[in-house]
Interface confidence: medium
């Protein structure tokens, strides 16, 4: 028999034995040109010494065999004495180790076996009820096909599954969708109808994501507010990446998972835009503001979770770049302006509502005034910032108000609304004594200690009601005690507090009265106590004396008085207190001893006021003796 | 009114050194982030480099990462592009650029006139 | 990189006409896309940004749309000083890329 003849005698070997796990398979005959065919196939196990026969019996039951050698692919034409026409019927004997193995038969129509194409180009991606769509557009003059797919996981081998058969200028398949794996698929065809033509090769890998994007891990952080009012947002851990199948470890498109950064500025809300979304990559300047960062995942088939981030404000507050005046007409705000055409958002909001929504005002675009600061008015009936409370100002600044990620803070304050000269107004004004010459006075905190860098200072004034002289103490805004000194007895003052800010004075409380009465010191009353005490004694003891030589001499003794309570004292818990000295003084000199007396108009409130006091029970002493200050002195603080 | 003016450019061969630089003036520069867009003869706009306000940041395109520099001295408002291993596809006439606020993002809103650099041995 | 593929190159059109110039990235860029013109030997200049805001100074017969990755540039009427080359640049991400460019010509 010639090489190119199929040879109708009988093999050169003995009867083939299929059962053999190993030896040819996947035997695929086709027509390659207008006479030409070819037939290939896989073999299975060592390949030394071994010789393959391709076998075919037509129809009319005669069979004849090609010997291809080692080789597993072999062409023919239409003159090779097999009918091309008509159905035949062929397989593969592979002879080797005096062993024959048999591959399974394939009985097809040469002439219409044409060689299928995979699905070429671009295999669309969809999915339909929880499942996998691809479509592709079918190969030229290839109308009617049998598909098959096979797919596989990072962990798991190939699995076969069938498409069903197409008859479409556009095939498409139904294929099992993963919720969290990604999946590499292969796709194949043959012509319709013919079950025993050849399946084409595999198409190149189709690489499909998990229906759930994987959820992002990452973290940020926020560097520091800077000088210019922006801090930068930056990306701590990258999103870990999804492992793949093998097919699809290289640039294959379709399985990439796109992180995106969503950003939500809550503070300024009456700005235009509050969102944008940019590439995880560019990571964003932001302002001083409070932000949610949301990363959202997504693939082919769309967003998967996302993981929200919450950026607090920054609380760095500048409490003196902010100016406020207060006129009839309203209040103007000033503040150093940024560039030309800069809009402002000037966001308040009262201390201790930070949940609540901030009210906020948009200016039109402005420039620096010639003093180079930016304004901002008000009137009164519109209301802002009109309640008697703290509020928390911040300002923001952009030249370009609709760009979310160009915004910058311009400063963060504090004011308090309202009447605050009024409100600020330090209430339970007391005055205690503290030395022979000074006072104590006290106050509570005012309401604009409430509000951080709003309360600039107390001043406390004193008034000496003889001469009319006025002095005032200025006193830190921590503190609300002030000691007066140098204070005269038996003078009048009366003092009164107020709470300054940086731009506004505030109201004095109401008057305080009160003076000190010169007191003798308690070396003085002891030894005035001791002194009389004494010449009574003396006194005593002589007319006792006097009168019991008298008596003895006038009057005859009496019995004892037992049962007689003419002479007994009235019970009671009368003690007496004496005011003892401090310290032993040499000189025993007339002191004045301080003894505070409060008084206030009438109509005027009453406050709860401590009057200075000696220890119970002992006598008040008012001397005659008027001590006077030194011309020219007056109240002195002591804080 | 905002001025944008580069210069540097010129003849150079292969292999050498170049740095251009874009004086700017009526407006802050420190402001603004600043960027370089090349144009080959004839063909289309090619950007090149881009850096933030403060010059913490910058960006570069891929045909010239490595080799070119982008920096700014905020001082004497000037940004300059350091060309080193210039190479022939490098011709273009390179134009300086200005972003509309602090990042290099949002297109650019003013350009310089341009100054074209030849590379050829 | 972000391939910007404009579309058509070159067009002929006469003054009044309407003309669209198309611009597709290769991946969704949000809105984050400008369109320039450049006349022959001058800078580009700055026409819309944000896919659809209209710089200042430029003449409202220019008007973008579009978002993600297909956007448009319309002319609504033609002027003679509007015949010069287009170009789109996306600047989502880096590095920021161009469109090779459009040539409007007089008809």
């Known amino acids: 028999c010639g090489t190119s003849e199929c040879c109708f005698q009988d093999p050169p070997y003995s009867d083939a034995d299929s059962g053999s796990a190993s030896g040819p398979r996947d035997l695929s005959c086709y027509r390659i040109s207008s006479a030409g065919y070819e037939c290939s196939w896989q073999y299975e196990g060592p390949t030394a010494g071994v010789s393959h026969f391709l076998r075919c019996c037509l129809s009319s039951g005669r069979c004849c065999y090609f010997a291809t050698g080692s080789a597993t692919r072999l062409q023919f034409s239409d003159q090779a004495g097999v009918s091309v026409l008509h159905t035949v019927t062929l397989w593969v004997e592979s002879w080797a180790r005096n062993r024959t193995e048999k591959s399974p038969e394939v009985t097809l129509q040469l002439y219409k076996s044409v060689k299928y194409k995979p699905p070429l180009g671009d295999i669309k991606v969809s999915k339909l009820a929880g499942q996998l769509r691809m479509e592709w557009e079918t190969p030229d003059n290839q109308v009617g096909a049998e598909v098959q797919f096979r797919h596989r996981t990072p962990s798991s081998s190939w699995k076969l599954g069938d498409c069903g058969p197409q008859d479409d200028d556009t095939e498409s398949c139904l294929c099992p969708l993963e919720m969290n794996v990604a999946q590499e698929f292969q796709l194949r065809r043959r012509r319709l109808g013919s079950q025993g033509s050849s399946w084409s090769k595999w198409s190149s890998p189709v690489c499909v994501p998990p229906e759930n994007p994987p959820q992002p891990q990452v973290r940020f952080s926020v560097e520091q507010l800077g000088r210019d009012g922006r801090r930068r947002l930056t990306l701590k851990e990258q999103p870990t990446q999804l492992e793949l199948p093998e097919g699809c470890q290289g640039p294959a498109p379709g399985v990439e998972v796109t992180y995106q950064l969503q950003l939500h500025m809550l503070s300024c809300p009456c700005k235009a835009k509050a969102t944008r979304t940019l590439p995880l990559e560019k990571m964003p300047y932001l302002s001083g503001a409070a932000y949610n960062v949301a990363v959202i995942s997504s693939n082919r088939f769309g967003p998967g979770p996302n993981q929200t981030w919450h950026i607090p404000a920054d609380t760095h507050t500048e409490p003196v770049a902010l100016n406020i005046s207060v006129g009839t007409n309203g209040t103007t705000m000033y503040w150093p302006a940024r560039a030309q055409s800069t809009t402002y958002c000037i966001e308040w909001q009262p201390v201790g509502q930070e949940g609540s929504l901030a009210t906020c005002n948009l200016t039109a675009p402005q420039d620096p005034d010639p003093a180079g600061m930016a304004t901002y008015s008000w009137s009164r009936e519109s209301g802002a910032m009109g309640q008697e409370k703290c509020y928390h100002i911040t300002i923001f600044a952009s030249a370009h108000p609709k760009k979310l990620t160009l915004w910058s803070t311009v400063l963060s304050t504090y004011h308090f609304g309202g009447n605050a000269s009024a409100a600020g107004t330090p209430h339970h004004v007391s005055v205690k004594n503290h030395s022979l010459d000074s006072v104590s006075v006290d106050w509570a905190p005012s309401l604009l200690s409430t509000c951080p860098g709003v309360l600039k200072e107390y001043v406390v004034r004193c008034r000496d009601e003889d001469s009319n002289q006025v002095s005032e103490h200025p006193v830190q805004p921590t503190e609300t005690q002030v000691t007066l000194s140098d204070l005269r007895a038996g003078v009048a003052y009366t003092v009164q507090v107020r709470a300054d800010t940086a731009w506004l004075r505030g109201a004095w409380s109401q008057p305080q009265r009160f003076s000190i009465k010169v007191q003798v010191s308690d070396w003085f009353i002891f030894f005035a106590s001791l002194g009389s005490f004494l010449s009574i004694l003396l006194v005593g003891v002589l007319g006792y004396l006097g009168l019991n030589r008298a008596t003895r001499h006038l009057c005859p003794p009496l019995p004892t008085p037992c049962a007689s309570s003419a002479i007994q004292f009235p019970a009671g818990k009368e003690t007496w207190q004496w005011i003892n000295p401090v310290d032993f003084q040499e000189e025993a000199s007339l002191q004045e001893a301080l003894v505070v007396e409060m008084s206030w108009d009438k109509g005027e409130r009453t406050e709860l006021l401590e009057k200075a006091e000696l220890p119970e029970g002992a006598p008040e002493l008012a001397l005659d003796t008027q001590l006077s200050l030194e011309d020219g002195d007056r109240c002195k603080a002591k804080m | 009114q905002v001025q944008l003016v580069e210069s540097g450019g010129g003849v150079v061969q292969p292999g050498r050194s170049l740095r251009l630089s874009c004086a700017a003036s009526?407006?802050?520069?420190?402001?603004?982030?600043m960027s370089w867009v090349r144009q080959a003869p004839g063909k289309g706009l090619e950007w090149v480099a881009g850096?933030?306000?403060?010059?913490?940041?910058?960006e570069y395109a891929d045909s010239v990462k490595g080799r070119f520099t982008i920096s700014r001295d905020n001082s004497k408002n000037t940004l300059y592009l350091q060309m080193n291993s210039l190479r022939a596809e490098d011709t273009a006439v390179y134009y300086c650029?200005?972003?509309?606020?602090?990042?290099?993002?949002?297109?650019?809103?003013?350009w310089g006139r341009g100054t074209l650099v030849t590379v050829s041995s | 990189a972000i391939q910007m593929t404009q579309s058509p190159s070159s067009l002929s059109a006469s003054v009044g006409d309407r003309v669209t110039i198309t611009c597709r990235a290769s991946?969704?860029?949000?809105?984050?896309l400008a369109w320039y013109q450049q006349k022959p030997g001058k800078a580009p200049k700055l026409l819309i940004y944000?896919?659809?805001s209209l710089q200042s100074g430029v003449p409202s017969r220019f008007s973008g749309s579009g978002s993600g990755t297909d956007f448009t540039l319309t002319i609504s009427s033609l002027q003679p000083e509007d015949f010069a080359t287009y170009y789109c640049?996306?600047?989502?991400?880096?590095?920021?890329?161009f469109g090779q460019g459009t040539k409007v010509e007089i008809k």
């Open positions: 850096i933030s306000y403060s010059g913490s940041d910058t």
């Open positions: 991946q969704g860029i949000s809105s984050d």
């Open positions: 650029a200005r972003s509309p606020d602090y990042i290099i993002d949002y297109g650019f809103d003013y």
């Open positions: 640049q996306q600047y989502w991400i880096y590095p920021f890329t």
């Open positions: 009526g407006f802050t520069f420190t402001s603004y982030g």
């Open positions: 944000d896919a659809s």
